[in-house]
């Protein structure tokens, strides 16, 4: 149903969906904290564009006593029975931040005339792809496909002269929802990623991910898993592993890597770390200082959501546009506006760009090191280290497939 | 479409240092490097370090070790290049590029003319 | 290594064909795709023609085409014309992971 939404006549509210069910643990308080330095900050940049107006936010709590799981199992319900609160307080904002799950997204997405923007921290899945009105300020799976395709064709870098067309993937099912939606991404068969390869195995169990890293006879030498250098440790353990195995794992929001006196563990030696590139220190703000560093990228999206929502207000304010229409709902896209820890830059669909990382363990210090970077904006890879002091033989990465020669 | 923008000219004394910046328009530093490349008054190109703003990972030619400092704030896009112990060789002009590819510079800032003169 | 070593000048006639070498070291130009070109007008910023040998930038006129044969990449410019009159320089990556320019050639349309 049609929805009044509070947003005119100079006061402008953000609707803020703060679920149970959410695509990390982090307390809601946190999230709550972040939204209002959010509002502190757009607040401030409306008023230096001369801009008398009044922003808000209003925080819609589910009731919790049904949908509890605290994950994202049962959040499809959850977002609906949200928005269903929204209608019958007659109290919609110009914005609707959260959710963060992909199955609440993709629900709510289909079962609302949607007038107005969405904005998520999360809805990572593929289903949430090519949305007209929904924005993603975290990493989506497409991005991470991308990124692998590139990688796996590219065969004229000084370490890596082998193109790859073959792929493990360990998907467990117990993976934290962002890993999830990126390993079902890759391992949907009319997904890109399975398109543009010949062969690729899902490995469900922990046996079968053991048994390959000794397999002679393997059909690839590359496993793509997703987590962080512990959960491959429990996986792994310090099995033996053959010299052609590269092991790719995935660990976008975790910034750990770049830290001084962080040194890889021996199990590391044959992994390729993907992460994104380390934010600005926000450890003096106030929103962030009870979070670890894999939460910081969560709480940083729903305060940059807020500092979006202030960067199109003030461009339809200033223009003279009416806030409450498609042309508003439609516009949260290809831009860049300034956001909490320097620009961010969405693309053509409403998702955040960035700059993948990929590391590597130098066998003589024993630290992370740049392989490459990946701006997720062009599609290109920009080599860093052209020298890398590997594990595997030669210093290169080796063909997917033992025993084929030159590609 | 990205631009990478200098200030036009600096004039400073032998022995000081210069700081060149070079801010980005249009676009982010993204994830590419920004080079540094110099050319004296008739001469040829000469290229005297690089940065990659999102990491900070920086390396200089060995002729300016020590001499030249390279950084970069990415909640700005801009890049600083700074020389120090100026002498009247020095004098030149000081492009930023980016590096699209290592070695490849697709996008050249107008260039600083640094004068070092007493 | 410096520099890498170009001609200092190379002349041709309009419509002719001329070819600019450009000699390194197995270190740079013969070990690494990342060999570039870039052609200045006087006073006027450089503008990338060729990068990675022998790829061209999008709006590159394709009478410019790059190659290499061992430690020496060559431009060629077919069919010259009076504004391809100008500076060219050679650039490549190093294995001591720095950048190196060639010497600079000159490049007359008679």
């Known amino acids: 149903s049609q929805v009044s939404q509070n947003c005119h006549n100079g006061s402008y509210e953000i609707s803020v969906l703060m679920m149970g069910n959410s695509a990390f643990a982090e307390p809601l308080k946190n999230l709550e904290d972040a939204v209002n330095e959010g509002l502190e900050i757009v607040r401030g940049r409306l008023q230096n564009a001369g801009l008398n107006v009044t922003v808000n936010a209003t925080f819609m709590y589910s009731d919790g006593l049904i949908h509890n799981s605290g994950d994202c199992r049962s959040s499809t319900c959850e977002g609906l029975d949200l928005l269903r609160k929204i209608s019958n307080a007659q109290r919609m904002g110009c914005v609707l931040i959260g959710p963060s799950c992909t199955y609440s997204t993709f629900q709510m997405y289909l079962d609302t005339e949607l007038s107005y923007p969405m904005i998520s921290a999360g809805s990572f899945g593929l289903s949430c792809d090519y949305k007209e009105t929904l924005t993603r300020l975290m990493s989506p799976a497409r991005k991470l496909m991308y990124f692998l395709v590139n990688f796996w064709k590219t065969n004229d870098l000084p370490f890596k002269t082998y193109s790859w067309s073959t792929s493990y993937v360990y998907k467990n099912g117990t993976e934290t929802e962002d890993c999830f939606w990126y390993l079902n991404a890759l391992e949907a068969s009319v997904s890109y990623f399975s398109h543009e390869l010949g062969f690729k195995v899902v490995l469900r169990q922990d046996k079968e991910f053991q048994d390959i890293l000794m397999d002679h006879n393997r059909k690839s030498n590359v496993i793509i898993m997703c987590g962080g250098p512990e959960f491959l440790y429990k996986l792994k353990g310090d099995r033996a592993v053959a010299e052609d195995i590269v092991i790719i794992l995935v660990d976008l929001f975790n910034d750990q890597y770049f830290e001084d006196n962080v040194t890889a563990p021996d199990y590391m030696k044959n992994v390729l770390v993907l992460t994104l590139s380390p934010g600005n220190s926000l450890l003096n703000s106030s929103f962030s200082r009870n979070l670890s560093p894999t939460k910081r990228d969560f709480a940083l999206a729903y305060l940059n959501g807020i500092l979006l929502f202030g960067h199109m207000l003030k461009i339809f304010l200033e223009n003279g546009e009416n806030i409450t229409t498609p042309k508003f709902a439609h516009a949260f896209r290809n831009l860049t506006f300034e956001g909490y820890d320097g620009p961010v830059t969405l693309d053509d669909w409403g998702d955040v760009d960035s700059t993948m990382v990929l590391l590597y363990t130098s066998v003589d210090t024993k630290k992370y090191k740049v392989l490459l970077t990946y701006d997720t904006h062009v599609n290109k890879t920009y080599p860093v280290d052209m020298s890398p002091t590997f594990t595997w033989k030669n210093s290169k990465l080796p063909n997917d497939i033992t025993g084929r020669g030159p590609q | 479409e990205v631009q990478l923008v200098q200030p036009g000219a600096e004039v400073k004394k032998p022995g000081s240092s210069v700081k060149v910046s070079c801010k980005a328009s249009?676009?982010?530093?993204?994830?590419?490097?920004i080079s540094w490349v110099r050319q004296a008054p008739g001469q040829g190109l000469e290229w005297m370090g690089r940065?990659?703003?999102?990491?900070?990972?920086?390396n200089y030619a060995q002729k300016f070790q020590g001499r030249v400092t390279i950084t970069a704030d990415k909640s700005t896009s801009t890049a600083y290049m700074e020389l120090s112990s100026l002498r009247s060789e020095d004098t030149a002009v000081y492009f930023c590029?980016?590096?699209?590819?290592?070695?490849?510079?697709?996008?050249w800032g107008q260039g600083t003319l640094v004068t070092v003169s007493s | 290594q410096s520099e890498l070593t170009q001609p200092a000048s190379v002349s041709g006639s309009p419509g002719q064909s001329i070819t600019i070498s450009c000699t390194g070291t197995?270190?740079?130009?013969?070990?690494?795709?990342?060999v570039s070109w870039y052609q200045q007008h006087p006073g006027k910023v450089p503008k990338l023609m060729i990068h990675d040998v022998s790829h061209r930038p999008s709006g590159v006129s394709n009478r410019f085409s790059g190659s290499r044969s061992g430690n020496t990449a060559s431009l060629t410019i077919s069919g010259l014309q009076a504004e391809d009159e100008a500076d060219y320089f050679c650039s490549s990556y190093t294995s001591s992971n720095n950048y190196v320019f060639g010497t600079g050639t000159k490049v007359t349309v008679l």
């Open positions: 249009g676009g982010t530093l993204s994830s590419y490097a």
């Open positions: 197995s270190s740079d130009v013969g070990g690494y795709i990342y």
């Open positions: 590029a980016r590096d699209q590819r290592p070695a490849s510079m697709d996008v």
């Open positions: 940065i990659i703003p999102i990491l900070g990972i920086t």
